[in-house]
Each structure stands twice: as structure tokens, then as C-alpha cells.
Interface confidence: low
């Protein structure tokens, strides 16, 4: 329906606090390197004027589209070209194109200084003196270091955050109280961060129609007694928010994430029987409990697949009249039975069953050539299972650790040319695969393992897009989106990687070692593990864990000594030096 | 701690084409935005081409479009200024400076580098 002022439509439906904490996201999800006081002097403006076009929808400009009203906005900033460069080109274009230039322009890994927490008691006394401050500083420094974190949950974000300071800043031991909920924030915001950022990639790189297929098996399995007209009415509404949040019309998309919760809780005995304690919650929390509630019990008695998908002679029929209706019922029909299968082997096996009809549905015997289409999932089921299996065995017989080791010198060796800090990361991110995952059943332990591999793979491939340096890489990143793990899996050691000259300076430690935290030591160590595999590709497990042991008796015995900084010095050249001797080079 | 050394400046004659070299240790080059700047005799620094870090995005200041291209490889941690069609006008010390943290864009603005080279003369005579 249309409204002669959006800016006013929008301001209307979500209120003053909720419209202006998007667009002060939205400004920063942008322009990431603007200085806090500048956005929310630009936010300012932005609801002053929504507020006279709520007064009157017919004063001037108040017609404007949202993009045309924020992308006037944003290219009133003076500094913009300095800042910026190249970006600035993007205010000489016109509606799409300009914020399509912006979105271009967003970056996945901007150069920013790290979040340092700094003591409880001054957190305390910041909330207290000005809590709205406190607050959007804290979106604006999260959504300008995450450019796709889903901004409607980032309220959500925001407002458990101000929940933790209220009830801590007032408890007999603030940090005990509030340590924990910030870590718990933290790594909570990372992971929603990074699973919004693979359904950006999948819209954007992949197109409307990998999102949607994404959505009917996600859907389906959680939702298995509904209706497929209703999974695919859900579908088509959270396409639509997605869609919305990835290319910036953050307002639209929270407006219509709520309307799709209402709907959902409206409709819930046609939808789910686990959504009652959702709804029974405030929006936020509510939209954010539906994207997380538990799959419902399957319906007793579902019929076997084959009769309607490879018995039944009207499969090419069928198939023939609506291609894409009918893959999605294939695809709903075989979710709903398979919530312990991942999303991304579903949607494999509908892409083989979808292959297999084209094929054969132009045969002279379609039935005679399809009839076998189902022994054809049998490997690509056991493929993900025989893998989890293996690797929750390596995870248990060596803990978090030493199994991120184990990746990282797998994955250094498969693409040595990525640089040493994303390598690390995502070595890391997917080494968490094991204390995420294995301590599940069988049951939720592929959807749980492989879906998350997505997730944290999408980061080596939005890293990797802003600096390609491996084929191998986009490759796998480009191909295709259920396939990336799989492709990532069968890489070899890349033969044709000339070794890096060995530098010593990679290898020089100092006191300031010492005083890291115990995750931030770890990361020092396994930064030096990538950098041996990628002079010494060819070394042997036995080889890099002895260097490695060395390297941490040497950490240990200096952190302790005395005169820390001479024992580096003096110890450190002694390893260097016999961990040449060790690996040959 | 990165280090710069710029080499391949040297007498050209109107109209010729020479091509800089920056190699750059200590860091990869790929995760830093880089530029070249120059500084002509009795003139500040003026900033001449940009490539951002971890994306080969490229910026060009208006008097050499056209005429220059940036451009690096990061298997050999080198950046490069190719410099056609030379003028007179662009006879100075060509310096190449980064700015890590892989910044997306690079900055006109010298004082945002913090690493630069020592420099190297390039002169546009007949």
C-alpha cells in the first residue's frame, strides 16, 4: 500500500526509538569510518525532518524515497572524499544506482582499532551519566565493524546489553555480574553476525532463488506440520526482510520482520506447535525466539517420497508445468522428514533429483531412466556424516585447541596463498565446530556441524573476494554455495605453493606475551604455526608438534624468568634456530 | 613495523614512461592500502595514486588519470607506479606509503600514513 511520505509511514510504525537507532545503524553500516558525534548529529537531522513530514505528509521532500532522504543525507559529509575516496564518487550518481555504489563500498574487515572493554566501574558511570549515549555508542561501534549484522536483532542486542548494566551496575560484585553477560553478548553477536552475513552472500551473490531454496529447507525442517503453501508464504515474507536488511533498507526491514511475527503467531496452529512461549513475549525477544525455536515433532505416518516423486508416472508432467513449485515441494517433502540432515545436504539432493529430471524427462523411457534417482543420495548423505564422524573423534581425543591446530595446518595447507590473520580466524571458527557440535546425538549433529561450516567458510569467502590471491579460493567460494564445504574438503595440499622465504622477525617474541590473555596467546601461537606450514609446507605432523611443544616451553620458561625481555631475546634465537634445524629449513 | 624501499626513478625525456617499485616487508601488501605521493622541489606533498588493502579498488589524483596505473602483486609484496606520457610538470621524489589494517579505501592525506619510503627521484627533461 502506498503512503505519500514513507520517511513518515516508517516513523509512524516503529516509533521515535526504534527509528532512530536503525538509521543511526544503517549511517554506520555505511560509513564505517565516521566519528560517532557525526552520525548522530546526521541521525538527528534524519528524525527532526521525519517528524514535520509526520505532521504533514505533504511538506516538501517529504515524498522522497528512504534512499534518495539517507543518501542526500550521507553525502552531506564533508569529509567524505578524504575519508572515503573513491566512495564519494558514489553521491554523483542517482537512486538505485547511488546506494548501490554505497553498498559496494561496505566493508567486511574495516579498518578499525579493536573494542577494548575498559573497567567495569567506568562502563558503570558511563551508563549512569548518559545511558542513551552509553547505548548507541554501543550500536554504532557494533554495526559499523558488522555492515550486515541483521539490524532488527541488534536492537535485540542492544537491549539485553542494556538490561546487563542496569541490573550489574547495582550488584555487590558489578564485574562477576557483568563480565559474563558481555562475553555471552559478545560471542552471540559474532555468530548472528556472521550466519546474517552468509544470507547477504547467498541474495547477493547466489540470487533470490538459492535464498528461497535456503528458506523452504530451513523452514520445512523446523515447521514439519505445516502446510506447504503456508512454508511458502513464510518464505516469500522472510525473503522479502532479508532482501531488505542486506541492501540497506534497514526501516522496511524491521517493519516487516514485526508484521511477520505477527503473522506467525496469529497463524501459529497452522504453523508450529512450539511457538506458544514465544508469543507470549515483547517483539523483539519475540521475533528473535521464532528464529531460534526448536523444530516441531514430525507428523505421525508420513507416506514414503518415492510414490509421488519417482513412482508416479506424472513426475515429468508435474515437473513440466511448474519447475520451481515442484522442486519445492520435493524439497519441503524431504526437510520435513530429515530434520537431522543439514540445509546444505538437502538442498544437494534436490539439486540431483532436479538434475536427474531435466535429464530425464527428455529420454526416451523417462520412468525406466529416474526410477533409480534416490541410490544416487546415498553417497552424498554418507559424505557429511563419514566427515563429522571422523572429525568429532580427532576433536575428543585432542579438545578445542589442539584441534584448531590440526585445521590450521589442513587449511594452510590446502590454500597457503590467504593471508596469515584470516587463516587463523577462520581456522579457529571452524576448530569450534567441535565443542558446538559434537556433544549432540547423532540425530542433530550434521545440521548442527555443517550448517555452521557454512557459516564460518562464507567468512573466508567474503575476506578472500576483497583480496583474491587463491583460484583454489573462489573457486570454491564462486561455484557453488551448497557445495563450498565439500569443495574446501577435497582440496589437497597445493603443490604448486612456493614456499615463503624464512624470516626471523616472524618468529621474534617479547615479554608482552606474557601479559595476554590466554585466547590472545593462543592466537600468537597459532599465528606462528601458519606462518611454519607456509615456509615448511611439506612438514610433517610430528615435525610442526615438536616445534611447536618447544615454542611453548619457551613462552612458559620466559614468562617466568626474571628479566623477561633478555630471556626472549637470548631463548628466542636458540628456538629459531633449532627449529630451522627441525624442519630443514 | 613496515618497511618501503622505492626503486626505478631516474631522467626521462617528455612523453617517455618509467615504472616504480615499492617492496614493502614486514607486512603483506595485500593488507594494507597503499599509495604513491610525490613532492615536486618547494612543494608539499602531493598525493598521485591509491589501492586500498584487501581490495584492489584503485584512486587516482586528476592530473595523472589516464597517464599512471597502480598496481601490485602480492606474491612479490611489491607495488608498482607505471607512469606514461611524462611531463615536465611531473618531475619530483616519488615516495610509496601504507596505512595497514587493510583498509578498504586509501586517503589523499599524507598524514593518515604512518609508513613511508625514502624516496626516489624521477626527472621529465629534454
Known amino acids: 500500500d502506498a503512503h505519500k511520505s514513507e520517511v513518515a509511514h516508517r516513523f509512524k510504525d516503529l516509533g521515535e526509538e526504534n527509528f532512530k537507532a536503525l538509521v543511526l545503524i544503517a549511517f554506520a553500516q555505511y560509513l564505517q569510518q565516521c566519528p560517532f558525534e557525526d552520525h548522530v548529529k546526521l541521525v538527528n537531522e534524519v528524525t527532526e525532518f521525519a517528524k514535520t513530514c509526520v505532521a504533514d505528509e505533504s511538506a516538501e521532500n517529504c515524498d522522497k524515497s528512504l534512499h534518495t532522504l539517507f543518501g542526500d543525507k550521507l553525502c552531506t559529509v564533508a569529509t567524505l572524499r578524504e575519508t572515503y575516496g573513491e566512495m564519494a564518487d558514489c553521491c554523483a550518481k542517482q537512486e538505485p544506482e547511488r546506494n548501490e555504489c554505497f553498498l559496494q563500498h561496505k566493508d567486511d574487515n574495516p579498518n578499525l582499532p579493536r573494542l577494548v572493554r575498559p573497567e567495569v566501574d567506568v562502563m558503570c558511570t558511563a551508563f549512569h551519566d548518559n545511558e542513551e549515549t552509553f547505548l548507541k555508542k554501543y550500536l554504532y561501534e557494533i554495526a559499523r565493524r558488522h555492515p550486515y549484522f541483521y539490524a532488527p536483532e541488534l536492537l535485540f542486542f542492544a537491549k539485553r546489553y542494556k538490561a546487563a548494566f542496569t541490573e550489574c551496575c547495582q550488584a555487590a560484585d558489578k564485574a562477576a555480574c557483568l563480565l559474563p553477560k558481555l562475553d555471552e553478548l559478545r560471542d552471540e553477536g559474532k555468530a548472528s553476525s556472521a550466519k546474517q552475513r552468509l544470507k547477504c552472500a547467498s541474495l547477493q551473490k547466489f540470487g533470490e532463488r538459492a535464498f528461497k531454496a535456503w528458506a523452504v529447507a530451513r523452514l520445512s525442517q523446523r515447521f514439519p506440520k505445516a502446510e506447504f503453501a503456508e512454508v511458502s508464504k513464510l518464505v516469500t515474507d522472510l525473503t522479502k526482510v532479508h532482501t531488505e536488511c542486506c541492501h540497506g533498507d534497514l526501516l522496511e526491514c524491521a517493519d516487516d520482520r514485526a508484521d511477520l511475527a505477527k503473522y506467525i503467531c496469529e497463524n501459529q496452529d497452522s504453523i508450529s506447535s512450539k511457538l506458544k512461549e514465544c508469543c507470549e513475549k515483547p517483539l523483539l525477544e519475540k521475533s528473535h525466539c521464532i528464529a531460534e525455536v526448536e523444530n516441531d515433532e514430525m507428523p505421525a505416518d508420513l507416506p514414503s517420497l518415492a510414490a509421488d516423486f519417482v513412482e508416479s508416472k506424472d513426475v515429468c508432467k508435474n515437473y513440466a508445468e511448474a519447475k520451481d513449485v515442484f522442486l519445492g515441494m520435493f524439497l519441503y517433502e524431504y526437510a520435513r522428514r530429515h530434520p537431522d540432515y543439514s540445509v546444505v545436504l538437502l538442498l544437494r539432493l534436490a539439486k540431483t533429483y532436479e538434475t536427474t529430471l531435466e535429464k530425464c524427462c527428455a529420454a526416451a523411457d523417462p520412468h525406466e531412466c529416474y526410477a533409480k534417482v534416490f541410490d544416487e543420495f546415498k553417497p552424498l548423505v554418507e559424505e557429511p556424516q563419514n566427515l563429522i564422524k571422523q572429525n568429532c573423534e580427532l576433536f575428543e581425543q585432542l579438545g578445542e585447541y589442539k584441534f584448531q591446530n590440526a585445521l590450521l595446518v589442513r587449511y594452510t595447507k590446502k590454500v597457503p596463498q590467504v593471508s596469515t590473520p584470516t587463516l587463523v580466524e577462520v581456522s579457529r571458527n571452524l576448530g569450534k565446530v567441535g565443542s558446538k557440535c559434537c556433544k549432540h546425538p547423532e540425530a542433530k549433529r550434521m545440521p548442527c556441524a555443517e550448517d555452521y561450516l557454512s557459516v564460518v567458510l562464507n567468512q573466508l569467502c567474503v575476506l578472500h573476494e576483497k583480496t583474491p590471491v587463491s583460484d583454489r579460493v573462489t573457486k570454491c567460494c564462486t561455484e557453488s554455495l551448497v557445495n563450498r564445504r565439500p569443495c574446501f574438503s577435497a582440496l589437497e595440499v597445493d603443490e604448486t605453493y612456493v614456499p615463503k622465504e624464512f624470516n626471523a622477525e616472524t618468529f621474534t617474541f617479547h615479554a608482552d606475551i606474557c601479559t595476554l590473555s590466554e585466547k590472545e596467546r593462543q592466537i600468537k601461537k597459532q599465528t606462528a604455526l601458519v606462518e611454519l606450514v607456509k615456509h615448511k609446507p611439506k612438514a610433517t605432523k610430528e615435525q610442526l608438534k615438536a616445534v611447536m611443544d618447544d615454542f611453548a616451553a619457551f613462552v612458559e620458561k620466559c614468562c617466568k624468568a626474571d628479566d623477561k625481555e633478555t630471556c626472549f631475546a637470548e631463548e628466542g634465537k636458540k628456538l629459531v634456530a633449532a627449529s630451522q634445524a627441525a624442519l630443514g629449513l | 613495523e613496515v618497511q618501503l624501499l622505492e626503486s626505478g626513478g631516474g631522467l626521462v625525456q617528455p612523453g617517455g614512461s618509467l615504472r616504480l617499485s615499492c617492496a614493502a616487508s614486514g607486512r603483506y601488501i595485500d593488507e594494507t592500502a597503499v599509495a604513491w605521493f610525490r613532492q615536486a622541489p618547494g612543494k608539499g606533498r602531493e598525493f598521485v595514486a591509491g589501492?586500498?588493502?584487501?581490495?584492489?579498488?584503485?584512486y587516482y589524483a586528476d592530473s595523472v588519470k589516464g597517464r599512471f596505473t597502480i598496481s601490485r602483486d602480492n606474491s612479490k609484496n611489491t607495488l608498482y607506479l607505471q607512469m606514461n606520457s611524462l611531463r615536465p610538470e611531473d618531475t619530483a621524489v616519488y615516495y610509496c606509503?601504507?596505512?595497514?589494517?587493510?583498509?578498504?579505501?586509501?586517503?589523499?592525506?599524507?598524514?593518515?600514513?604512518?609508513?613511508w619510503g625514502q624516496g626516489t627521484l624521477v626527472t621529465v627533461s629534454s
Open positions: 589501492i586500498g588493502g584487501g581490495v584492489d579498488i584503485t
Open positions: 606509503a601504507a596505512r595497514p589494517g587493510r583498509p578498504l579505501i586509501t586517503s589523499k592525506q599524507a598524514d593518515l600514513y604512518p609508513y
